[in-house]
């Protein structure tokens, strides 16, 4: 699948991880960080 | 199940205003882009444009430009295109599609211009 | 614009048979091509993505390919519910662009 990164206007949308956009899906996709899931990474866990 | 539920058809005159629904179901709304498609009949598909549901962004086909709106309203997961200036050459059916795995389409709206 | 020049417009074929279609970029896409099906009924849905990935639930039998600029789907053994209109469509550039189609009728 390729990505790129999601532009400017995407800020915030990953409330703790990165946006990237999946072209062949026309997906926002969020790489959340560690400790975090979600679809926007919303969710903490231990 | 995710779905997107267009209404069948619009029957609208010459010179007059529409606005299409897509209302999207089963999936998270503002995780993909919204696509918009006509097809004239016994035709071919034509892309108009796509709409990002978390902020509105969009992009056009630049033939479309001056045609058609697209808008999202993210309370209730719909996504709408307001079609202007309708002629005969506008009559169609209009698809909403997203590209999540497996594809989506609503079953499309048939748009008549007649007066 | 990107054109899309879909190739052949209609084809007729037997149930078992082997058919292959084309599409030819007018510019350089990167792979970044789907076939679509579109049923009688008007129902659309996504084959093939980013050239020869086959899509979720999609039967073995189609398949995707590239050499150069030429990008085709190939049904290895037609079966009945595979008669229907075919599209590629290119989403390298905007305005994403389809082909003209090609109508796949039995023989």
């Known amino acids: 699948v390729s990505i790129t990164k999601c532009s400017s206007d995407m800020n915030g949308y990953c409330l703790h991880g990165q946006c990237i956009y999946l072209v062949d899906m026309s997906q926002n996709y969020c790489r959340c960080e560690v400790g975090y899931t979600g679809v926007r990474c919303e969710h903490f866990f231990l | 199940q995710v779905q997107l539920q267009q209404p069948g058809a619009e029957l609208v005159k010459p010179g007059a205003s529409v606005k299409l629904s897509c209302k999207a179901s089963g999936y998270t709304f503002t995780s993909y882009w919204m696509h918009w498609v006509k097809q004239r009949p016994g035709q071919g598909l034509e892309w108009i444009g796509e709409i990002n549901p978390y902020n509105g962004g969009t992009n056009y086909n630049e033939k479309f430009k001056s045609k058609a709106t697209l808008t999202v309203d993210k309370s209730s997961s719909t996504a709408y295109m307001q079609l202007s200036s309708l002629t005969s050459e506008d009559s169609a059916v209009y698809y909403c599609?997203?590209?999540?795995?497996?594809?989506?389409w609503g079953q499309g709206t048939l748009v008549t211009v007649s007066a | 614009d990107i054109q899309m020049t879909q190739s052949p417009s209609s084809l007729s074929a037997s149930l078992g048979e082997r058919v292959s279609l084309t599409c030819r970029a007018s510019?350089?896409?990167?792979?970044?091509l789907s076939w679509l099906q579109q049923k009688p009924d008007g129902t659309i849905k996504r084959l093939i993505y980013?050239?020869?990935t086959l899509d979720s639930g999609v039967p073995k039998r189609f398949s995707g390919s590239r050499s150069g600029s030429d990008y085709s789907l190939t049904i290895s053994s037609l079966e009945s519910e595979d008669f229907a209109d075919y599209y590629c469509?290119?989403?390298?550039?905007?305005?994403?662009?389809f082909g003209g189609g090609t109508k796949l009728e039995i023989k």
């Open positions: 469509l290119q989403y390298a550039s905007y305005p994403r662009t």
């Open positions: 980013a050239a020869s």
């Open positions: 599609t997203i590209w999540k795995l497996g594809t989506y």
């Open positions: 510019q350089e896409i990167s792979g970044y």
